[in-house]
């Protein structure tokens, strides 16, 4: 058993049929010695008396808010949550495995630039009695500060018969150094509590590996005189790190015909303009990636050819 | 470069960008690792890193690029020695067209661009114990190539910025 925060405790249980559970001793936070009784949650049933209460915690029915009373007045509370371990593995019932980029990916994180700011998100099908808290640091043995904001419900989607909820959080490294080579990874820890179930999820990454630029902006097409060709141009996204002579992007461009099956030639360039053949009903698209490190490509930015 | 002269920024830019391409072709990003390549955070602490105080940011380069260039050169030589060591020469053997061979040559080429013959900056000692098992060797190769990718990315940014803003 360990203290999650004041008056909230997590009991770690090996979860299998007829498991013995954990013996827990609760102590009433009061100078009083006599006439103390204990109850669990809203039930008025007295579980025991005395300054301490010893219980055997085996299942969710044994978890909840234990209160010690004297003369009808509540003296202190202890909330017990359960953290299940099945076959040596902590339970992951609350969050959905996003399976990208690999199995057992519960938290996904992205950064739009090298400023030390990043966003993490996760998915669940649970809609009520759910709370999250997030902590983050750079490195774990001698952690450096990362500040995270409040967790927000960022999207709701219908998947078949189920509703899926996406939660996200934004974090910022306290002393970011965008030009340096990261040596220690960022660690993100999410605590999830659903009713009386506690779970924790972690992710470890370098900012450089989670970079995904915003799409290029300001796409423009300029037809060339007496030619089927057009000059296309675009700009770095506003959110990308500066100066661009240092934090450079590379681009992938393509002209997509009306039919999705039509062969599309992709051209890679470090410039912010190109000359292409852009037929009527086709569209021109461009995406960006860090020029020197193969992190994610941005989403496509597109403009119709006509 | 030693003694304060300027490097051939444009040449360094080209070669460092080639290094980036080679480093990624030698160890592409894959969705999952077949061998666990994540270790504790100390595993790559013995390789040189370009850190915050090394003057490799745009402002530091404008003030005095020498500190940064010295750091980059130390790293290049360190990685060049690693790629020539028995971590890479042992089993499983590199084939004649291995991108590691090209990487090795390009690391040497860029370090020489930064230091003409006759000047010698001190370089970090290469860690000597080399793994005996092929799987340990593979793991170490992946770790080295991953950290090399990060190192050459910063070096390439430095040279691109230098070529754009510091070239005479």
């Amino acid at each position: 058993i360990w203290e999650l925060k004041k008056d909230v405790y997590v009991v770690e249980l090996d979860w299998y049929p007829d498991a013995p559970g954990e013996m827990v001793v609760l102590t009433c936070d009061t100078p009083e010695e006599d006439g103390i009784t204990w109850t669990l949650d809203q039930s008025g049933e007295v579980l025991g008396s005395g300054k301490t209460l010893t219980i055997q915690v085996k299942e969710f029915g044994d978890a909840g808010q234990y209160t010690c009373h004297k003369g009808g007045e509540a003296l202190s509370h202890s909330l017990l949550l359960l953290h299940k371990k099945e076959d040596g593995i902590w339970s992951t019932d609350v969050l959905k495995d996003q399976k990208e980029p690999k199995n057992k990916t519960f938290l996904r994180c992205e950064a739009k630039n090298y400023s030390g700011r990043f966003t993490c998100w996760w998915l669940t099908t649970i809609s009520t009695d759910l709370t999250f808290s997030v902590k983050s640091s750079r490195g774990s043995s001698n952690p450096q500060g990362v500040t995270c904001g409040a967790v927000t419900l960022s999207a709701e989607r219908v998947r078949g018969d189920n509703k899926e909820y996406e939660y996200s959080v934004e974090c910022q490294e306290d002393s970011a150094c965008p030009a340096a080579e990261e040596r220690l990874p960022i660690e993100v820890m999410v605590d999830a509590i659903h009713k009386l179930k506690y779970e924790n999820y972690t992710s470890s990454f370098f900012i450089r590996d989670i970079i995904k630029p915003d799409p290029p902006k300001n796409l423009q097409l300029k037809p060339l005189k007496n030619s089927r060709q057009v000059e296309v141009s675009w700009e770095y996204p506003d959110t990308w790190s500066t100066p661009h002579s240092y934090f450079s992007l590379t681009f992938c461009i393509q002209v997509q015909g009306k039919s999705k099956r039509e062969k599309k030639d992709r051209i890679f360039t470090d410039k912010t303009s190109a000359t292409v053949i852009c037929r009527k009903n086709a569209s021109f698209s461009v995406q960006a990636q860090d020029r020197y490190y193969s992190s994610s490509w941005s989403e496509w930015a597109s403009v119709p050819c006509s | 470069v030693p003694g304060g002269s300027s490097p051939a920024w444009a040449q360094c830019q080209q070669l460092s960008q080639k290094l980036c391409t080679l480093a990624w072709s030698a160890h592409p990003l894959v969705g999952h690792m077949d061998l666990r390549e994540e270790g504790d955070e100390e595993t790559t602490n013995d390789v040189p890193h370009i850190q915050c105080g090394d003057g490799c940011d745009p402002q530091g380069l404008r003030d005095n690029s020498q500190f940064c260039l010295q750091r980059i050169r130390q790293g290049l030589i360190f990685y060049e020695k690693l790629l020539g060591s028995d971590i890479f020469t042992g089993e499983p053997s590199l084939l004649p067209d291995s991108p590691v061979g090209q990487l090795h040559a390009s690391l040497l080429g860029l370090s020489q661009l930064l230091q003409p013959e006759g000047h010698h900056w001190e370089t970090q000692q290469i860690p000597s114990p080399s793994p005996s098992q092929p799987w340990q060797r593979l793991l170490l190769r992946f770790k080295i190539l991953r950290s090399l990718q990060a190192f050459v990315a910063v070096a390439a940014r430095v040279f691109a910025h230098g070529a754009a803003t510091l070239s005479p």
Epitope: - | D34, S93, L95, P99, V100, L138, L145
Partner: nanobody, 121 residues
């Protein structure tokens, strides 16, 4: 040039056993993944079993519990132990290896020439 050479194919009775071998010209640590595939004339090549470096084998549903893939690092060889053979197992069996990217700039996928397995009573 990296080569894979299969052997051990031949005639086997239904319910019988056969052991296929695939010898590599380089250390099998050179391969990120090694696999056995099979092909019947006029049909697409299908995956039978694969094994990753440091991993354990994965099998196609049709052979699970009957076939076993293993390797011998010292002999630079991978094996396919075929037990309880069925008529539908008859095919040309190919060995495949995918080389680690850092070992070569070309031809990451290496194939053997194949070995014929015939199932007949």
């Amino acid at each position: 040039e990296v080569q894979l050479v299969e052997s051990g194919g031949g005639l086997v009775q239904p319910g019988g056993s056969l052991r296929l071998s695939c010898a590599a010209s380089v250390s099998i640590w050179s391969f990120k993944v090694m696999g056995w595939y099979r092909q019947v004339p006029g049909k697409q090549r299908e995956l039978v079993a694969t094994i990753t470096t440091g991993g354990s084998p994965d099998y196609a549903d049709s052979v699970k519990g009957r076939f076993t893939m293993s390797r011998d690092y010292d002999k630079r060889t991978v094996f396919l132990e075929m037990d309880s053979v069925k008529p539908e197992d008859a095919a040309v069996y190919y060995c495949n290896g995918r080389l680690w990217a850092h070992l070569t700039s070309s031809g990451h996928d290496v194939w053997g020439q194949g070995t014929q397995v015939t199932v007949s009573s």
